[in-house]
């Protein structure tokens, strides 16, 4: 995770700040998962593509007391504060599968690490 | 401890401009949404603007036009910028951290304020 | 814009009372079961403060006295034995549909 960005060096804050924020946090999540996440609590998948900060909001703002991922909530509302318009993303509810928070969490990681090496941090 | 400091407040005439800034501590700035609320004197609370991490901006139609919510990560700063002021700008404005729309506006700074008058 | 109405616009009470504030919404303010209503303490000359999100959820930090509900258009925010400290005035808020809008205020008074 140390290589995600210079934590070390001083200057102006890169635009990948607030992409490698979320991944730390996520990587806290799964590394401090000792009972199931969430007490097991499933959630949707959703398209890890446009829209994607939104919709991982959305799947995940029904998991309701698990304090766990709370700070991921709000990290993720930085990216979309506010509601998105109906149609905007279509994918946002796209409802067919669900997953545990945990993979949830895991799949989602990955994802973001991903875009972190490609340089996309928007 | 969260903490949020407005200052660039004062008296402007009808039709002036002026810059307000926020000072943040406290939480990784970058990593969330903010925003402007305005008061007028004596009265209830007003959403003026919104900008993402990613900044993107967000105005209610009252100011949208005139005034240009903006950041500064490397500063941990926020700003808006108004234009074009009336008597109706008159007001206390506070910056706030928007934790989004399922949060609400999580912190408030005490305010600074804004005077609209020849 | 969706308006919001707050009732009543001040009230007398007493410390150790039970406290009710109603909001009420011109149109739903509900998103796929989530009601979008959040709920603010302001004293005099000081910052508005942050007691619920999402209708009833209990901000960090906030007594356990205050609690809210509702959902839709009709909601509630309810101080369960009124302490010094709570005399201030509330405000209920939308973020179900820009422009946010807040409700006009309900100043609770020293009886």
């Known amino acids: 995770l140390t290589c995600l960005g210079g934590f070390a060096s001083p200057g102006p804050v890169p635009p990948s700040t607030a992409l490698r924020e979320l991944i730390e946090e996520l990587v806290n999540i799964t590394q401090n998962q000792k009972a199931p996440l969430c007490n097991g609590s499933m959630v949707w998948s959703i398209n890890l593509t446009a829209g994607m900060y939104c919709a991982a909001l959305e799947s995940l703002i029904n998991v309701s007391g698990c304090s766990a991922i709370e700070k991921t909530q709000r990290m993720l509302s930085g990216f979309c504060p506010h509601k998105v318009s109906a149609g905007q993303f279509s994918s946002l509810h796209v409802r067919d599968t669900k997953i545990e928070v945990a993979q949830f969490v895991k799949d989602l990681l990955l994802h973001l690490k991903k875009l972190f090496r490609e340089g996309q941090f928007n | 401890e969260v903490k949020l400091v407005e200052s660039g407040g004062g008296l402007v005439q009808p039709g002036g401009s002026l810059r307000l800034s926020c000072a943040a501590s406290?939480?990784?700035?970058?990593?969330?949404?903010m925003s402007w609320v305005r008061q007028a004197p004596g009265k209830g609370l007003e959403w003026v603007a919104s900008i993402s991490s990613g900044g993107n901006t967000y105005y209610p139609d009252s100011v949208k036009g005139r005034f240009t919510i903006s950041r500064d990560n490397a500063k941990n700063s926020l700003y808006l910028q108004m234009n074009s002021l009336r008597a109706e700008d008159t007001a206390v404005y506070y910056c706030?951290?928007?934790?989004?729309?399922?949060?609400?506006?999580?912190?408030w700074g005490q305010g600074t304020l804004v005077t609209v008058s020849s | 814009d969706i308006q919001l109405t707050q009732s009543p616009s001040s009230l007398s009470a007493s410390v150790g009372d039970r406290v009710t504030i109603t909001c009420k919404a011109s149109?739903?303010?509900?998103?796929?079961?989530?009601?979008?209503m959040h709920w603010y303490q302001q004293k005099p000359g000081k910052a508005p403060k942050l007691l619920i999100y999402?209708?009833?959820n209990l901000e960090s930090g906030v007594p356990s006295r205050f609690s809210g509900s509702g959902s839709r258009t009709d909601f509630t925010l309810t101080i369960s034995s009124l302490q010094p400290e709570d005399f201030a005035t509330y405000y209920c808020?939308?973020?179900?549909?820009?422009?946010?809008?807040f409700g006009g205020g309900t100043k609770v008074e020293i009886k």
């Open positions: 149109e739903s303010v509900d998103n796929y079961g989530k009601s979008l």
């Open positions: 706030a951290r928007l934790d989004g729309y399922y949060f609400g506006f999580a912190y």
């Open positions: 808020q939308q973020s179900n549909e820009d422009p946010w809008t």
């Open positions: 406290g939480f990784t700035f970058i990593s969330y949404a």
């Open positions: 999402r209708a009833s």
